[in-house]
Amino acid sequence: IWELKKDVYVVELDWYPDAPGEMVVLTCDTPEEDGITWTLDQSSEVLGSGKTLTIQVKEFGDAGQYTCHKGGEVLSHSLLLLHKKEDGIWSTDILKDQKEPKNKTFLRCEAKNYSGRFTCWWLTTISTDLTFSVKSSRGSSDPQGVTCGAATLSAERVRGDNKEYEYSVECQEDSACPAAEESLPIEVMVDAVHKLKYENYTSSFFIRDIIKPDPPKNLQLKPLKNSRQVEVSWEYPDTWSTPHSYFSLTFCVQVQGKSKREKKDRVFTDKTSATVICRKNASISVRAQDRYYSSSWSEWASVPCS
Amino acid sequence: RAVPGGSSPAWTQCQQLSQKLCTLAWSAHPLVGHMDLREEGDEETTNDVPHIQCGDGCDPQGLRDNSQFCLQRIHQGLIFYEKLLGSDIFTGEPSLLPDSPVGQLHASLLGLSQLLQPEGHHWETQQIPSLSPSQPWQRLLLRFKILRSLQAFVAVAARVFAHGAATLSP
């Protein structure tokens, strides 16, 4: 058993038929010695008396909020949560496996630049009795600080017959060094509580691997005289690291016809302009990627040819 | 070529070669489809590689103040990786494919290190750890780890030279 936060405890249980469970001793936080009784939130009966209560925690019926009372007055609470381990594997019932970039990916994270700020998100189909808390650090043996905000519900979408809820959190490395080569990964730890079930999820990454620039901005077309060609120009996104002579991007310019089946013309360039042929009803799109490290491409910025 | 004693390197040549190194490092080990190498306990294998750290002066301000600290650090790393790519980790079994970019990568590392430090001028170089994996699969894993680490290193080096070429060239 260990303390998650004040008055909230996690009991780790090997989950198999007829498992012996874990003996837990609860102590009432009071100077009182006599006349103390104990109750469990989901049951109306008195469980025991005295300053301490010993319980055998085997299943969810044994978890919950234990309260000690004296003469109708509440003295203190202890909330017991269960963390299930089956066949040596901790349960992952609360979050949805996003399966990208690989199986058992519950947390996904992205950064728009090298400032040490990043966002992580996760998915669940659960909407009630659900809480999250997030911690992060750089490295684990001698951790350096990363500050995370509160997890918030960032999107709600319908997937088939079901609703899916996306939660996200923003974190910032306390002493970020954008120009350095990372040697220790960022560790992100999410504590998830659904009803009386506790689970934890972790992700480990280098900022450089989760970089995804915002799309290029101010995408413009300038027709060239007596030609079907146009000069496409754009700018670095505002959120990208500066100076751009140091933190450089490379770009992919695509001409795409109305039909998805039409051949796409693609040009790669390090400049912020390119000359392409603009076909009728086509659109021109540009996306960006770190010039020197192959992390994710940005989403496309697009303009119609007409 | 760099001139010993604090003169500027040939920023533009270094920029071109370092950008080529980035391309080669990624073609030698594309990210897609490989295992997450950080899960494979890399502390003991790749923690000894030289990293370009916060105090090494490789940020834009540090380069403006005195680029020599950073260039020395980059040179150390280039020599280190050049030696690793020439070691039995890469030359032993399983053999690399004939058209593997590792050979070009090895030559380019050497080329950039020589641009930074001509013959007769010596910066101290870092000791190469003795990594001699016995099993072919260990060697394969180590190759992946070294190449992943090299990708990060050459990205920083390329940024340094790009910035130098744009702002510090005579």
Partner: antibody, heavy 121, light 107 residues
């Protein structure tokens, strides 16, 4: 002991409004969520939604968004269900049901006796 | 929404028999399943929560089991007062849905 006592049966014309009450006793009203469940004659149970008795925030199941409203009178430990523009298909017994615990909102440990609301045509 | 398919719809048994009702969820609901008993003319009563935990005061002849999508409710020795409709309910994901019910009749 814990009790949920609901208001009596109602006979309503189509288009009218009905407001059912559910008075709680024997526990701290604001500690536990209050759910509403519909049971059409001879049919199964359908969860309508719940109201957070501490914040007053209601949550409605998709089928009960629009004409249905949950509300509270905390000082009287009472929850209300209002149905506007009453329709034939609203004829049912409506139950209020208290959550099992502060941590388990949508398992129902205590139920009101039910209020039958019938449409009169 | 998650569909809870409960079988059988009707059960005609004798006192002393063992009865098993099953509930199948259309997707995994972990162990977030409750079972209720509704006697004629009464409101439902909670018997089992978290798939296998008997609620306070519920006789130990009532048991529940299951995880994921398949859940079972058992009355080990049926008694005359067990005449009722039994419902399963998933309380994993909103909207929290009930099975269609199983009507237990005593011969």
């Amino acid at each position: 002991q814990i009790q949920l006592v609901q208001s009596g049966p109602e006979l309503k014309k189509p288009g009218e409004t009905v407001k059912i009450s559910c008075k709680a006793s024997g526990y701290t009203f604001t500690n536990y969520g209050m759910n509403w469940v519909k049971q059409a004659p001879g049919k199964g149970l359908k969860w309508m939604g719940w109201i957070n008795t501490y914040t007053g925030e209601p949550t409605y199941a998709d089928d009960f968004k629009g004409r249905f409203a949950f509300s509270l009178e905390t000082s009287a430990s009472t929850a209300y269900l209002q149905i506007n523009n009453f329709k034939n298909e609203d004829t049912a017994t409506y139950f209020c049901a208290r959550s099992l615990s502060t941590m388990i909102t949508t398992t129902f440990a205590y139920w009101g006796q039910g209020t039958l609301v019938t449409v009169s045509s | 929404s998650i569909v809870m398919t409960q079988t059988p719809k009707f059960l005609l048994v004798s006192a002393g028999d063992r009865v098993t009702i099953t509930c199948k969820a259309s997707q995994s609901v972990s162990n977030d399943v409750a079972w209720y008993q509704q006697k004629p003319g009464q409101s439902p009563k909670l018997l089992i929560y978290y798939a296998s935990n008997r609620y306070t005061g519920v006789p130990d002849r009532f048991t529940g089991s299951g995880y994921g999508t398949d859940f079972t409710f058992t009355i080990s020795t049926v008694q005359a007062e067990d005449l009722a409709v039994y419902f399963c309910q998933q309380d994993y994901s909103s909207p929290y849905t009930f099975g269609g019910g199983t009507k237990l009749e005593i011969k």
